[in-house]
């Protein structure tokens, strides 16, 4: 069975075809939800509105964007906030209400045709029984704007580390790739002895942060080779 591969609590070496799977004890806990589950048509109304935790703008409704609720607040805790109307301050397109975009830090109308290449499309995530109806969870995303591209927050799906915000790297999680925190001093890291020698890592860790390297923990030198614990340590 694949139990040992997907058991996140252990680091195990497995026979082919899957190779070894690294556990993931060194990662920080994501503040925003990593999973969204669709409800059906019947569940599109909200009885009592609650702040909805998010990791990126596309997890919020059409009239919302994802940000920390307090200015300069903990960047780890983000919720869906009401979009900003015309002439309000902004930092990216998604902050502005539909029909507007962020230009020079201000939400302006996107009616002008010259903006077409950069305009945001409204994506409706349809979770009911008819994908052709706009009955679902609306999400906005910037199509081609390099200037206003928002980097992925922790838990966001990514293709490469440059897709992730500062302090995060793009690493494997289950069968996908998400932005995870770069490892801090003292956190467990994965040391690959030879390039290509490691097997499949279902839960990949990020690399150690700046000024740190992945080395055997000093008090683990006596342990057997296989159980040596590596941590991020100062050079």
């Amino acid at each position: 069975t694949l139990n040992s591969v997907l058991n996140s609590n252990a680091i195990k070496n497995l026979p082919p075809p899957l190779g070894g799977a690294a556990g993931h004890p060194g990662s920080a806990v994501s503040a925003a939800p990593g999973i969204l589950y669709p409800g059906g048509n019947k569940y599109q109304t909200i009885d009592n509105y609650q702040p909805y935790p998010c990791a990126e703008d596309e997890e919020c409704g059409t009239d919302e964007y994802c940000a920390s609720p307090t200015r300069g607040g903990d960047a780890g805790v983000q919720i869906c906030l009401a979009c900003r109307k015309r002439r309000k301050r902004c930092m990216r397109h998604a902050m502005c209400c539909p029909g507007n975009y962020c230009k020079n830090g201000i939400c302006v109308s996107s009616d002008q045709n010259h903006f077409r290449g950069e305009i945001e499309e409204t994506i409706t995530e349809s979770f009911g029984n008819d994908h052709s109806t706009l009955d679902g969870y609306s999400r906005r995303t910037t199509l081609s704007s390099k200037m206003y591209h928002t980097k992925g927050q922790e838990g966001s799906v990514c293709l490469r580390s440059s897709d992730c915000a500062s302090g995060l790297c793009c690493a494997r999680h289950f069968w996908s790739k998400i932005c995870k925190p770069v490892l801090k001093e003292g956190q467990v890291c994965t040391k690959h002895r030879r390039k290509g020698s490691h097997g499949l890592e279902i839960f990949q860790r990020c690399y150690c942060g700046e000024g740190l390297s992945c080395r055997i923990q000093k008090d683990h030198h006596q342990a057997s080779n296989s159980s040596r614990l590596h941590t991020c340590q100062r050079h």
Epitope: L2, N3, V5, L6, N7, S8, N9, L18, G23, H24, P25, S27, V29, S30, P33, G34, I35, L36, Y37, P38, E58, E59, I123, E125, F127, R139, V157, C158, L159, R172, H173, F174, W175, S176, K177, I178, L200, F203
Partner: antibody, heavy 114, light 112 residues
Framework: QVQLVESGGGVVQPGRSLRLSCAAS????????MHWVRQAPGKGLEWVAV????????YYADSVKGRFTISRDNAKNTLYLQMNSLRAEDTAVYYC???????WGQGTLVTVSS | DIVMTQTPLSLSVTPGQPASISCKSG???????????LYWYLQKPGQPPQFLIY???NRFSRVPDRFSGSGSGTDFTLRISRVEAEDVGIYYC?????????FGQGTQVEIK
């Protein structure tokens, strides 16, 4: 529109083959692991197969191992399930599913009958 | 495989009354990333799954707040505070911490 749309289902004789497709749109398909899950008439869901974001790693339920092959074309944002040596017990609605921020398609019915 | 056991298998509820469904997993669903990969979904005849709860207790943003999830480790509960006619169907729990994804047997909820 963020969605998954399955196609390719139909009626097929035992021992024959069928290829299902799942067209993804509205999200970064190439970053997500993708799964196939099926549901036999009147029964619960059964996980069938998974493929990693890059297509390099695949895993199958014991019931389909050696007969089914999962694959993906990230350039076309499409997931596939090649089903060979079909049996009556493979009759089910087949759903493709995105992991993490889970999203399911509407399903496509495969009926294996002589 | 992780066995998911649901109780009861059927439930008949008066509209406006509460309902509670239990789900037990054969092993802990707590991942080292701090998340517990347990979900609840509702299925109606001829329809795909409608997911209600993710990671034990998080409601999908458009799901009414009469639905709530709780639990940890291996014991989980889905509660509907006031059942409505539209809530009928089969409720399933599901885990995805480990392959294969596995599902509870389902709890049929009907209105009295």
């Amino acid at each position: 529109q963020v969605q998954l749309v399955e196609s390719g289902g139909g009626v097929v004789q035992p021992g024959r083959s069928l290829r299902l497709s799942c067209a993804a749109s509205g999200f970064t398909f190439s970053g997500y692991g993708m799964h196939w899950v099926r549901q036999a008439p009147g029964k619960g869901l059964e996980w069938v197969a998974v493929i990693s974001y890059d297509g390099n790693d695949k895993y199958y339920a014991d019931s389909v191992k050696g007969r089914f092959t999962i694959s993906r074309d990230n350039a076309k944002n499409t997931l596939y399930l090649q089903m060979n040596s079909l049996r009556a017990e493979d009759t089910a609605v087949y759903y493709c599913a995105r992991e993490l921020r889970v999203l399911w398609g509407q399903g496509t019915l495969v009926t294996v009958s002589s | 495989d992780i066995v998911m056991t649901q109780t009861p298998l059927s439930l008949s509820v008066t509209p406006g009354q509460p309902a509670s469904i239990s789900c037990k997993s054969g092993q802990s669903l707590l991942h080292s990333d701090g998340k517990t990969y347990l979900y609840w979904y509702l299925q109606k005849p001829g329809q795909p799954p409608q997911f209600l709860i993710y990671e034990v207790s998080n409601r999908f943003s458009r799901v009414p707040d009469r639905f709530s999830g709780s639990g940890s480790g291996t014991d989980f509960t889905l509660r509907i505070s006031r059942v409505e006619a539209e809530d009928v169907g089969i409720y399933y729990c599901m885990q995805s911490i480990q392959l294969p994804w596995t599902f509870g047997q389902g709890t049929q909820v009907e209105i009295k």
